[in-house]
Interface confidence: low
């Protein structure tokens, strides 16, 4: 009779995470009498997975029925299948002997890979906030997922960008892999409502990416406008100046009022109106008792913005004229409209 | 608004050029300026800018034609814009128009650039490059 | 870079529109008669028009393009029609230029 073959018709197996993998083995003969075993690895570290003889393994079932007479179908199902399961299984036939059992025969191996889905990706933008114009870069992880094949893209607001890089960890073979990427992206003053996307594509996603954001309202800085301009008089001897603070964001801002240099009045923005593209507008206002005066007054409006210096507008309140509308004159440190960010 | 340049005409090859505009009608201070050319018979194309503000972090920008051999400055008392290009070539020929933009610069920020904001254009100065 | 299309055409009365993409936020429109002719600005920052300029020129922006629509097109319209804009380094940049022929 022809001495006895351990055939393990399958090079491989994918099997995906939480699902049972089926390892198949057969034996060509009945002869020699001895059990089988399953091992994970070759040599001497290998890890028992099902020993036919004796042992409890709660997660291996067999395919047939191993305790009949002329069974030689060893095939295996293992559930539950996680990425630490992956590796090279071998079927080894044993033939009895005494004290130990003695090996016989092993099959050529199977191995089994893992599909895990990767981990929801998690979006992490910069630690302090920046203006328009500035470059931020983003960073996207998710881990846990097998095979290493894995596309990522970035987005912001629908429109695909390109400048990122990718690592996926590690560059070996491994159970599972993690990937991390690094994208950078241009603010504009219009990104207060953006949102910027991190898309994972893998084999086990079936189509499906996964996706992880940020909004920019978190990382975006809008700096304000500031202008200053002046009332019609109110009374006899009462000016009315107000200091308008438009498109700036977040709202955390603290305006000082200062005649002649020296501070009248702080307050800070609450009652703020918002823009289409969820910059804020505030105005404050200063009534100036010109009577109190004997020189001409120089009204300063100045804002604190988001723990940034100071930018202020300022407006030269004549009081030797009788006091009626006069244009905005704009002699200050910080002078311009604010809304582009040139760093 | 107007913006008079002068300043082109026959230049010789490896020469340099200096153009001059003259700005009238508005607070010449406050808004960013720039050079614009056309070469015959083709597109509009940047030369320089040069922004308002004193410590912007954007002060000077020049087109990829002229990165290095071009420098662009301003004189606000004079209202005047200048545009000095060296080692010039064939290349360099063509029509320079000085351009205002909408706005200006302050030390930290922008109403205006550029090419994407500009509101007033000179005539233009020939330069001819020409041995 | 911009890109914009070469040619476009129209009957008098009609609306043309030019479009411009590139990655920019803002973008101007400059339209110039003949070459070598200072050119006038007809949009800047995306919508706005300077004094002067007719309402029948409109700018809007949708995503990373840039359209100038022009409105009961005339004769007088033809002309070639630049976009321009600012890279990441704040260097301008202009389109080819785009040919309005009425027909």
């Known amino acids: 009779e022809e001495e006895l073959q351990v055939i393990q018709p399958d090079k491989s197996v994918l099997v995906a995470a939480g699902e049972t993998a089926t390892l198949r083995c057969t034996a060509t003969s009945l002869i020699p009498v001895g059990p089988i075993q399953w091992f994970r690895g070759a040599g001497p570290g290998r890890e028992l997975i099902y020993n036919q003889k004796e042992g409890h393994f709660p997660r291996v079932t067999t395919v047939s029925d191993l305790t009949k007479r002329n069974n030689m179908d060893f095939s295996i199902r293992i559930g539950n299948i996680t990425p630490a399961d992956a590796g090279t299984y071998y079927c080894v036939k044993f033939r009895k002997g005494s004290p130990d059992d003695v090996e016989f025969k092993s099959g050529a191996g199977t191995e089994l890979s893992v599909r895990a889905k990767p981990s929801a990706p998690v979006v992490s933008g910069p630690a302090a906030r920046a203006t328009p114009q500035h470059t931020v870069s983003f960073t996207c992880e998710s881990h846990g997922f097998s095979p290493r094949d894995i596309t990522l893209k970035w987005f912001k607001n629908g429109n695909e960008l390109s400048d990122f890089q990718t690592n996926v960890d590690p560059v070996g073979e491994s159970v599972s892999y993690s990937i991390h990427s690094t994208a950078k992206v241009v603010l504009t003053r219009e990104d207060v409502h953006s949102q910027v996307i991190c898309e994972v594509a893998h084999v086990t996603l079936q189509g499906d990416p996964l996706r992880g954001t940020a909004n920019l309202s978190e990382t975006i800085r809008v700096p304000p406008t500031l202008e200053v301009t002046q009332q019609p008089v109110r009374a006899e001897n009462q000016v009315n100046v107000t200091c308008q603070v438009r498109k700036f964001y977040p709202q955390r801002l603290q305006l000082t009022w200062l005649e002649n240099g020296n501070v009248s009045r702080t307050e800070t923005a609450s009652t703020v109106t918002e823009n289409k593209d969820g910059t804020y507008n505030w105005m404050s206002w200063l009534l100036v008792n010109v009577s109190a005066h004997r020189d001409d007054v120089k009204l300063t409006c100045q804002v604190e913005h988001d723990g940034q210096p100071a930018v202020s507008k300022s407006h030269d309140l004549k009081v030797s004229a009788h006091p009626k509308e006069q244009g905005s004159n704009t002699a200050a440190e910080n002078t311009g409209s604010n809304e582009r960010n040139i760093y | 608004v107007t913006l008079d340049e002068s300043g082109g005409g026959l230049q010789t090859p490896g020469g340099a050029l200096s153009l001059v505009c003259k700005a009238s009608?508005?607070?010449?201070?406050?808004?960013?300026m720039g050079w614009v050319r056309q070469a015959p018979d083709k597109g509009l194309e940047f030369v320089a800018g040069i922004y308002t503000g004193s410590d912007a972090g954007l002060s000077t920008t020049y087109g990829a034609a002229v990165q290095g051999r071009a420098t662009i400055s301003r004189d606000n008392g004079q209202s005047t814009v200048r545009l000095q290009l060296n080692n010039l070539g064939a290349e360099d020929t063509g029509i320079y128009f000085c351009t205002k933009s909408a706005g200006g610069c302050s030390d930290y920020n922008c109403d205006a650039y550029i090419a994407d904001s500009i509101d007033a254009w000179g005539h233009g100065t020939e330069v001819i490059v020409s041995s | 870079a911009v890109t914009q299309p070469a040619s476009v055409s129209a009957n008098p009365g009609e609306t043309v529109k030019i479009t411009c993409s590139g990655s920019?936020?803002?973008y101007g429109w400059y339209r110039q008669k003949s070459p070598g002719s200072a050119p006038v600005t007809l949009i800047?920052?995306?919508?706005k028009r300077p004094s002067g300029i007719p309402s029948r020129f409109s700018g809007s922006k949708s995503g990373s393009t840039n359209t100038l629509t022009i409105t009961g097109v005339q004769a007088d319209d033809e002309a070639v029609y630049y976009c321009g804009n600012e890279d990441n380094s704040y260097v301008g940049i202009f389109g080819a230029g785009t040919t309005l022929t009425v027909l």
């Open positions: 920019s936020s803002y």
């Open positions: 009608g508005f607070t010449f201070s406050s808004y960013n």
């Open positions: 800047y920052d995306n919508d």
